[in-house]
Amino acid sequence: CSCSSLMDKECVYFCHLDIIWVNTPEHVVPYGLGSPRS
């Protein structure tokens, strides 16, 4: 997976968990086991 910033500690930590990357109007967000807070 890829995070928009390697400084995003949470993204880097969770990104291996079968995350599928999807585009939103604002930015790229992860959607995996659950979902990012809307």
């Epitope: 930590y13 291996h16 079968d18 992860p30 979902s35």
Partner: antibody, heavy 118, light 108 residues
Framework: EVQLVESGGGLVKPGGSLRLSCAAS????????MNWVRQAPGKGLEWVSS????????YYADSVKGRFTISRDNAKNSLYLQMNSLRAEDTAVYYC???????????WGQGTLVTVSS | EIVLTQSPGTLSLSPGERATLSCRAS???????LAWYQQKPGQAPRLLIY???SRATGIPDRFSGSGSGTDFSLTISRLEPEDFALYYC?????????FGGGTKVEIK
Amino acid sequence: EVQLVESGGGLVKPGGSLRLSCAASGFTFSSYNMNWVRQAPGKGLEWVSSISSSSSYIYYADSVKGRFTISRDNAKNSLYLQMNSLRAEDTAVYYCARDNWNYSFDYWGQGTLVTVSS
Amino acid sequence: EIVLTQSPGTLSLSPGERATLSCRASQSVSSSYLAWYQQKPGQAPRLLIYGASSRATGIPDRFSGSGSGTDFSLTISRLEPEDFALYYCQQYGSSPLTFGGGTKVEIK
């Protein structure tokens, strides 16, 4: 000293709701990812849900997805689990656990018992 | 879902003996994502090992973890009376996070 104290468990009828709380102390709560793990009577451990430190990433086990909601209030050093549409198979001791940023849970509360029965 | 199979289900040993517990994954798990916990009756689990082989804070050096891929193990070099308990492995490498079924280490 790190402490996690769960509350809110009890007896509820099938289809009912409960809200569990976990009060954290002894560490900077807002810096840690948190989790709920449950254990049915006489059974093994089952991961329920995870929430990242800022609440940006929220994950659920398939068995609870759509029925349970995890949340946190960093200002109150508290973790929550809203449980709706409860089923008999949700009967368990529910533990909150701190994720230590090493892909494991280094501190656990003592648990709160949820019993779903008519 | 990664299924973790622990064996044996029960291990009957005497204090001072060596205990070797196995955790086999249904698919490969990076060693970074494998942990071991101890649980005693009526108590919450306690983290022993993370990253397959790193001891958690305060864990005695008689506990050691090893393994990679699909086969992991927890070794207790010399059993102390307080070590008789349930032991669980857990993987954090794939969704959902899963625990093994546990191994009970009992006094022979």
